[in-house]
Interface confidence: low
């Protein structure tokens, strides 16, 4: 069972996960170092935030926050058309409640067991948790 769980985590990290490093400010943010090689289904994403090189990260990126807080943030290349479309889609999705002023840090543990932290200026376009369908 433990082996199977470890394999499952490894697969998730290989498929979508972000190799991260701490920001230059000693841990105020996590940086994505490598883009996901696969398009991310909008279904699994609830919001996104932008990673700016000016904030101490080596590459620009869009970090998509999964609906399940137990999963690691998904890292994508902002130049990709599908990334821009997904961001637009999330922007259009009605929020279930008014976003808080500024941006709270997301303290949900990631799949890697590392605490996922938001960064200043992150976009909290929360996706409705209970759409009409299911």
């Amino acid at each position: 069972m433990a082996q199977s769980l470890a394999l499952s985590l490894l697969i998730l990290v290989l498929a979508f996960g972000i190799p991260r490093t701490q920001g230059s400010d000693g841990g105020a943010q996590d940086c994505c170092l490598k883009y996901s090689q696969r398009k991310i289904p909008a279904k699994v994403v609830r919001s996104y935030r932008k990673q700016e090189p000016s904030l101490g990260c080596s590459i620009p990126a869009i970090l998509f926050l999964p609906r399940k807080r137990s999963q690691a943030e998904l890292c994508a290349d902002p130049k990709e058309l599908w990334v821009q479309q997904l961001m637009q889609h999330l922007d259009k999705t009605p929020s279930p409640q008014k976003p808080a002023q500024g941006c709270r840090k997301d303290r949900g543990a990631s799949k890697t067991g590392k605490k996922g932290k938001g960064s200043k200026g992150c976009k909290r376009t929360e996706r409705s948790q209970t759409p009409k369908g299911p």
């Epitope: 499952s8 398009k39 289904p41 909008a42 699994v44 479309q85 889609h89 759409p131 369908g133």
Partner: antibody, heavy 120, light 108 residues
């Protein structure tokens, strides 16, 4: 060989209950989200429910919400669908299907289906 | 929920002809989130195309998918006898997976 095999279908009276099982083999079961999809006789496909790989996230179609419960036992490589308060309109072939890319996607592997008939 | 409408309901063609099947969504579907399935009588559906344009493992090159936003297309470049079946589109963009009502491709 990657395989899903449903069982538990049969004839049940309206208001009755049934539990479907889907036995998986040939892949790391605990890595995949799984689904139930049904097809009424001569009709199209209807998604019924999904469950995340660790079983902590589930969702249901409006038509079955509150009556059906999806669950899984990763130690047994088995997916379940508990169906209560069955109605005539629940009559269908029920398929279990695996999400293609682990966390919510198209369905790449399907079982052969099990027929549920709700009739008095 | 996103409603998918497939057209035509039935397509009557001969082997060797080109088949073009349409799937229209009631609202925006991320183009990464649409699939096509083939189903033959008495069989389970089979995944043909995922992420709108990627062929699933083992699917012949005559099957191709395209489209984005709300309009998607499945094309079978030259129909083989085994291709006569019902085809369904499916979106997995929002939290409910919805299917189109199906297009039956029959022998003329």
């Amino acid at each position: 060989e990657v395989q899903l095999l449903e069982s538990g279908g049969g004839l049940v009276q309206p208001g009755g209950s049934l539990r479907l099982s889907c036995a998986a083999s040939g892949f790391t079961f605990s890595s995949y989200w799984l689904n139930w999809v049904r097809q009424a006789p001569g009709k199209g496909l209807e998604w019924v429910s999904y469950i995340s790989n660790q079983g902590d996230d589930t969702s249901y179609a409006d038509s079955v919400k509150g009556r059906f419960t999806i669950s899984r036992d990763n130690s047994k490589n088995t997916l379940y669908l508990q169906m209560n308060s069955l109605r005539a309109e629940d009559t269908a072939v029920y398929y279990c299907a695996r999400d293609y890319q682990y966390i919510g996607d198209s369905f790449d592997i399907w079982g052969q289906g099990t027929l549920v008939t709700v009739s008095s | 929920e996103i409603v998918l409408t497939q057209s035509p309901a039935t397509l009557s063609l001969s082997p060797g002809e080109r088949a073009t099947l349409s799937c229209r969504a009631s609202q925006y579907v991320s183009y990464v989130s649409l699939a096509w399935y083939q189903q033959k009588p008495g069989q389970a559906p089979r995944l043909l195309i995922y992420d709108a344009s990627n062929r699933a493992t083992g699917i012949p090159a005559r099957f191709s998918g395209s489209g984005s936003g709300t309009d998607f297309t499945l094309t079978i470049s030259s129909l083989e006898p085994e291709d006569f079946a019902v085809y369904y589109c499916q979106q997995y963009d929002d939290l409910s997976y919805t299917f189109g009502q199906g297009t039956k491709v029959e022998i003329k």
